[in-house]
């Protein structure tokens, strides 16, 4: 058993038939000695009586608030959860495998540049008595800063016949250079917290894998003279790292119809101007990647040909 | 220590032509290694990352872009700092900045060298013949050093009497190979910079 | 299995005009660019235009611009392309290839040998 | 137009070794690089698109690296039925222009 926070204790369960659980003690918070009663969440049923009481935890029934009393007041309460381990792996039923980049990965996270910001989401189909806590530092052993901000509900989608929930976190490192080598990862953990039920997530990323920019801006077009050629132009995203000249993009431009099996002209260039042959009821697309560290590349940027 | 006295090419930059072949070669080969190494720890998650010019050069500090001298996190390491106060680096000569920067890359480029020299031999060793280092990648490292065109006391190849482990040395060339390829990131970056300049 | 057959082999005088067609089988005409190449005996590849069948829409390599026209028939999903003022430098295999993709090719002709003599 | 330059022009080769032919582009093409195999009597057969994207059907001994001017073709052991002509076709801009074509032959 540890603590999670003042008053809420995780207690850690080989989770299989007839396991024989944990014996759990727990102290009443309270200069009083004698008069002191238990209880378990809503009931009234005493549970024992006396400074501690001694319970045998193997289920989620035997888990929850319990409560000590004297004379019908209050006196302290201690929260315990549940973390389930099943044949040495502990349990992920809180959130969905979002089996992106490889399976099992239950975080996802992005930078748009290389300022230390980066955001994190996660999936789940839980809709209510759900809590997230992030935690994040760079490296482990000597963990650097990094400040998370709390969780949020960021979308919601219909999938099939279920809701899914996405939550995100944005989190920047507190003294972040854009310039630097990183040699320790950032680590992400996350805590997740389902009624009863306990389980943490954790990611292990550098920032220069998880760059992501943003769409180019300011796409513009310029057909040229007797031509079916157009030169397309662009200006790097505001959100990406500065000076452009150090932190380089390279861009990948595209000619396509509406549907993705249809023909198109695509051309990758350094430059922020690309010449393309434009089709009717065609658009052109520009996405962006980092020129000299091949990390993903950004959502399209799109203008019709018309 | 004296760094040595850089007489850089006035037009910069077939430098940045061999920096981008560089970063290609290192790349190519760092793909390769981990193809040929699939069942050693060769991934970015499973190898230590290790820089073996730490406290040696200050490659990162000394070729940052003045528009990030004024980021304190990008200041605080900084052994071989040519910036004594927050806003004078207009008043020092940008040659001498960037004097300092280029040496540093060819001391870089030097320790890798050596140890890839040394790692190599290695390897030629190995009964399996598993890997051996691209030539064309010790050849560019070689051009990038001559277009850099730098004076330095040659450092002498390591050589080993005991018997090498092959195992532990595709482990170590996993490691090399990882940092170079982040450091070849940041010569390309600085190249590409210093020819926009 | 997308397909392209050529029209058998020329013999042209200097100064005359060939016509070689290139029928599509296999995927929809009209949703690939076709692009026309020749190479001459022992030597490299050259590009000279691409056209989109789809609305005719045509691109020529300057070396050809004026001497060379390309077609497109998607009731036959049949090219052509067509050169005029042969001489004999024009003596060459002639390949047509296509691609969903403008700037290369992924799928050629057998070829069409042109020779050009007097 | 853009001159692509070849070399070597003939590359003699051992079977299963190894064999690179170079490609260089008269200005900077990005990645906009693509190698063709062209067996006598035959029409070329896409291997690479975009200097290093891999194209279905083709062994994965054959692969492709470089962008800017300079482009590399590798093929990590030579078989018997890889003793053919090369070519690359820059697609940066228009005209599309090929390498002159190196011929790997048997050594």
């Known amino acids: 058993i540890w603590e999670l926070k003042k008053d809420v204790y995780v207690v850690e369960l080989d989770w299989y038939p007839d396991a024989p659980g944990e014996m759990v003690v727990l102290t009443c918070d309270t200069p009083e000695e004698d008069g002191i009663t238990w209880t378990l969440d809503q009931s009234s049923e005493v549970l024992g009586s006396g400074k501690t009481l001694t319970i045998q935890v193997k289920e989620f029934g035997d888990a929850g608030q319990y409560t000590c009393h004297k004379g019908g007041e209050v006196l302290s309460h201690s929260l315990l959860l549940l973390h389930k381990k099943e044949d040495g792996i502990w349990s992920t039923d809180i959130l969905k495998d979002q089996k992106e980049p490889k399976n099992k990965t239950f975080l996802r996270c992005e930078a748009k540049n290389y300022s230390g910001r980066f955001t994190c989401w996660w999936l789940t189909t839980i809709s209510t008595d759900l809590t997230f806590s992030v935690k994040s530092s760079r490296g482990s052993s000597d963990p650097q800063g990094v400040t998370c901000g709390a969780a949020t509900l960021s979308a919601e989608r219909v999938r099939g016949d279920n809701k899914e929930y996405e939550y995100s976190v944005e989190c920047q490192e507190d003294s972040a250079c854009p310039a630097a080598e990183e040699s320790l990862p950032i680590e992400v953990m996350v805590d997740a917290v389902h009624k009863l039920k306990y389980e943490n997530y954790t990611s292990s990323f550098f920032i220069r894998d998880i760059i992501k920019p943003d769409p180019p801006k300011n796409l513009q077009l310029k057909p040229l003279k007797n031509s079916r050629q157009v030169e397309v132009s662009w200006e790097y995203p505001d959100t990406w790292s500065t000076p452009h000249s150090y932190f380089s993009l390279t861009f990948c431009v595209q000619v396509q119809g509406k549907s993705k099996r249809e023909k198109k002209d695509r051309v990758f260039t350094d430059k922020t101007s690309a010449t393309v042959i434009c089709r009717k009821n065609a658009s052109i697309s520009v996405r962006a990647q980092d020129r000299y560290y091949s990390s993903s590349w950004s959502e399209w940027a799109s203008v019709p040909c018309s | 220590r004296n760094l040595p006295v850089a007489t850089p090419d006035p037009g910069m930059f077939p430098c940045l032509h061999h920096s981008q072949n560089l970063l290609r070669a290192v790349s190519n080969m760092l793909q390769k290694a981990r193809q040929t190494l699939e069942f050693y720890p060769c991934t970015s998650e499973e190898i230590d990352h290790e820089d073996i010019t730490k406290d040696k050069t200050s490659t990162v500090e000394a070729c940052l872009p003045l528009e990030l001298t004024k980021n304190e996190s990008c200041l605080n390491s900084r052994e071989t700092s040519f910036i004594t106060n927050g806003s004078c680096l207009a008043s020092r000569k940008t040659s001498f900045m960037m004097a300092l920067c280029l040496s540093s890359i060819y001391e870089d480029l030097k320790m890798y060298q050596v140890e890839f020299k040394t790692m190599n031999a290695k390897l030629l060793m190995d009964p399996k013949r598993q890997i051996f280092l691209d030539q064309n990648m010790l050849a560019v490292i070689d051009e990038l050093m001559q277009a850099l065109n730098f004076n330095s006391e040659t450092v002498p190849q390591k050589s080993s009497l005991e018997e090498p482990d092959f195992y532990k040395t595709k482990i170590k060339l996993c490691i090399l190979l990882h940092a170079f390829r982040i450091r070849a990131v940041t010569i390309d970056r600085v190249m590409s910079y210093l020819n926009a300049s | 299995q997308v397909q392209l057959v050529q029209s058998g082999a020329e013999v042209k005088k200097p100064g005359s005009s060939v016509k070689v067609s290139c029928k599509a089988s296999?995927?929809?005409?009209?949703?690939?660019?076709l692009h026309w190449s020749r190479q001459a005996p022992g030597q490299g590849l050259e590009w000279m235009g691409w056209?989109?069948?789809?609305?005719?829409?045509?691109e020529y390599a300057p070396k050809f611009q004026g001497r060379v026209t390309i077609t497109a028939d998607e009731s036959t999903s049949t090219a052509y392309m067509e050169l005029s003022s042969l001489r004999s430098e024009d003596t060459a295999v002639y390949y047509c290839?296509?691609?969903?993709?403008?700037?290369?090719?992924?799928?050629w002709g057998q070829g069409t040998l042109v020779t050009v003599s007097s | 137009d853009i001159v692509m330059t070849q070399s070597p022009l003939s590359l003699p080769v051992t079977p299963g070794e190894p064999a690179s032919i170079s490609c260089r582009a008269s200005?900077?093409?990005?990645?906009?690089l693509h190698w063709y195999q062209q067996k006598p009597g035959q029409q070329p057969r896409l291997l690479i698109a975009?200097?290093?994207q891999s194209i279905s059907g083709v062994p994965s001994r054959f692969s492709g690296s470089g962008s800017g001017t300079d482009f590399t073709l590798t093929i990590s052991s030579l078989q018997p039925e890889d003793f053919a002509t090369y070519y690359c076709?820059?697609?940066?801009?228009?005209?599309?222009?090929f390498g002159q074509g190196t011929k790997v032959e048997i050594k």
């Open positions: 975009f200097a290093s």
């Open positions: 290839a296509r691609n969903k993709e403008l700037r290369y090719i992924d799928v």
């Open positions: 056209i989109d069948p789809e609305n005719g829409d045509t």
């Open positions: 200005q900077s093409i990005s990645i906009n």
């Open positions: 076709q820059q697609s940066n801009s228009f005209p599309l222009t």
């Open positions: 296999g995927g929809t005409f009209s949703d690939y660019y």
